[in-house]
């Protein structure tokens, strides 16, 4: 006899990276017929929702109108059908950005490189932080972590056309509080002609969506959003 229900999916809209004082919605998708959803924050009960009518709803939303450092951290959700509870969802790391200062980002040997050259990004922030994050725009939300007193290096290794795209970095004051983003650096990789058509760059977001960072314009399955957020967050843990 089944003791628990399958775990729900959890994700943040528009994104798990939220500028301070901006709004964010945490979504939890379970099963139709669920009578109660619970959102847990850092291991403690944070909010409860009871959908009506439960048989017509398989997703609930928990709205945070004003993001701040106290709201940043790890969230999970569970749901109940009758007396049976689900497994907890994966952890959602909700990050507050636009804290304190703006780092600078440079790329070596330069923003225009030839396929096969080794490329390194450098991120610098003079205020008290020792962890840095490099993000590439695009649906896959690549995140790299680096460490250093005032700057960190992010070696990409020999590049291919798949590395083309726009990069930004953040300083991280803790796992869930990040600086403003750096100005973007667009990496252009030329050469490797035979692979160009096989290795397009990630679909990137229109430039103006960076106002709230990596806002997704995709309209695919909600599960995809959850997996996408979860992939990028693996580095936070």
């Amino acid at each position: 006899q089944q003791q628990t229900l399958p775990k729900p999916f959890i994700w943040a809209e528009p994104h798990f990276m939220v500028p301070k004082e901006k709004q964010v919605t945490i979504c939890c998708q379970g099963n139709y017929g669920a009578v109660e959803y619970q959102l847990h924050f850092e291991g403690s009960l944070f909010a409860v929702d009871r959908p009506k009518p439960p048989e017509r709803i398989n997703k609930v939303q928990f709205y945070i109108p004003d993001m701040n450092s106290r709201m940043a951290g790890q969230y999970s959700c569970i749901y109940r059908v009758g007396e049976l509870w689900s497994e907890p969802s994966n952890l959602l790391d909700l990050v507050v950005t636009e804290m304190y200062d703006t780092p600078t980002l440079s790329v070596h040997p330069g923003p225009e490189v030839i396929s096969g050259e080794k490329v390194t990004f450098y991120c610098r922030l003079d205020t008290a932080t020792s962890m840095f994050l490099l993000l590439k725009e695009g649906r896959s939300s690549h995140v790299q972590r680096g460490y250093g007193k005032v700057q960190a290096e992010f070696p990409l290794g020999p590049v291919t056309t798949a590395h083309r795209g726009t990069y930004r970095c953040f300083g991280s004051y803790n796992n869930h509080a990040w600086s403003f983003p750096s100005e973007p650096v667009k990496l252009l990789v030329t050469g490797d002609i035979e692979n160009t058509s096989l290795a397009p760059e990630d679909p990137t977001f229109p430039a103006d969506t960076w106002g709230t960072y990596l806002l997704t314009t995709e309209t695919g399955l909600q599960k995809d959003h959850a997996l996408w957020d979860h992939t990028a967050q693996n580095l936070l843990r």
């Epitope: 070596h108 040997p109 080794k118 610098r124």
Partner: antibody, heavy 115, light 107 residues
Framework: QVQLVQSGAEVKKPGASVKVSCKAS????????MNWVRQAPGQGLEWIGM????????NYNEKFKSRVTMTVDTSTSTVYMELSSLRSEDTAVYYC????????WGQGTTVTVSS | DIQMTQSPSSLSASVGDRVTITCRAS??????LNWLQQKPGKAPKRLIY???SLDAGVPKRFSGSGSGTDYTLTISSLQPEDFATYYC?????????FGGGTKLEIK
């Protein structure tokens, strides 16, 4: 055209510091790394470090880290390299070289360290 | 640090000869390799970047090849102005390092 013009020759005593300048023209100064390389008499080339004028990001060769400081004055498109605690083995020609790929080089500055 | 072993350290050749200079890196440097030419009392001049890309204005008799750890500079037909010292330079990983140089002399 791209030009990198370096300051004139210097003679220093052991223990002193030297500050060499490299004035750039003919391109967007803040868009490219600037490297510093030295060459002792009759010897090969040795990379000292680099700075990015747009971000003040530096990367120094560990060998020189405790003694070198690179700075930028964007108003005059000039990069500076200061080397302290000089010793006789620092006698060399010091070059600035633009870009991560070292595409253009200054004419060199001779630094002589002698008591 | 990545060591760049350049050979030969010196080479005597005649005008019209085909000359090959090699550089071996102590680890993979991708294609992040330059070849530089230096004449006495002058600053180095870059000839080739990213292993095989020829700089503007450099004669086509110069060519570069290689990958991983082994790289080659070839001068297909030596001219009088080619007698100089040549250096390889890896810019893949800091500290960036140069080969020891090859002094090309007239036979």
């Amino acid at each position: 055209q791209v030009q990198l013009v370096q300051s004139g020759a210097e003679v220093k005593k052991p223990g002193a510091s030297v500050k060499v300048s490299c004035k750039a023209s003919g391109y967007t100064f803040t868009s490219y790394w600037m490297n510093w390389v030295r060459q002792a008499p009759g010897q090969g080339l040795e990379w000292i470090g680099m700075i990015h004028p747009n971000s003040d990001i530096t990367n120094y060769n560990e060998k020189f880290k405790s003694r070198v400081t690179m700075t930028v004055d964007t108003s005059t498109s000039t990069v500076y390299m200061e080397l302290s605690s000089l010793r006789s083995e620092d006698t060399a020609v010091y070059y600035c070289a633009r870009h991560g790929r070292f595409d253009y080089w200054g004419q060199g500055t001779t630094v002589t360290v002698s008591s | 640090d990545i060591q760049m072993t350049q050979s030969p350290s010196s080479l005597s050749a005649s005008v019209g000869d085909r000359v090959t200079i090699t550089c071996r890196a102590s680890q993979d440097i991708g294609s992040s390799l330059n070849w530089l030419q230096q004449k006495p009392g002058k600053a180095p001049k870059r000839l080739i970047y990213a292993t095989s890309s020829l700089d503007a204005g450099v004669p086509k008799r110069f060519s570069g090849s290689g990958s991983g750890t082994d790289y080659t500079l070839t001068i297909s037909s030596l001219q009088p102005e080619d007698f100089a010292t040549y250096y390889c330079l890896q810019y893949a990983s800091s500290p960036f390092t140069f080969g020891g140089g090859t002094k090309l002399e007239i036979k």
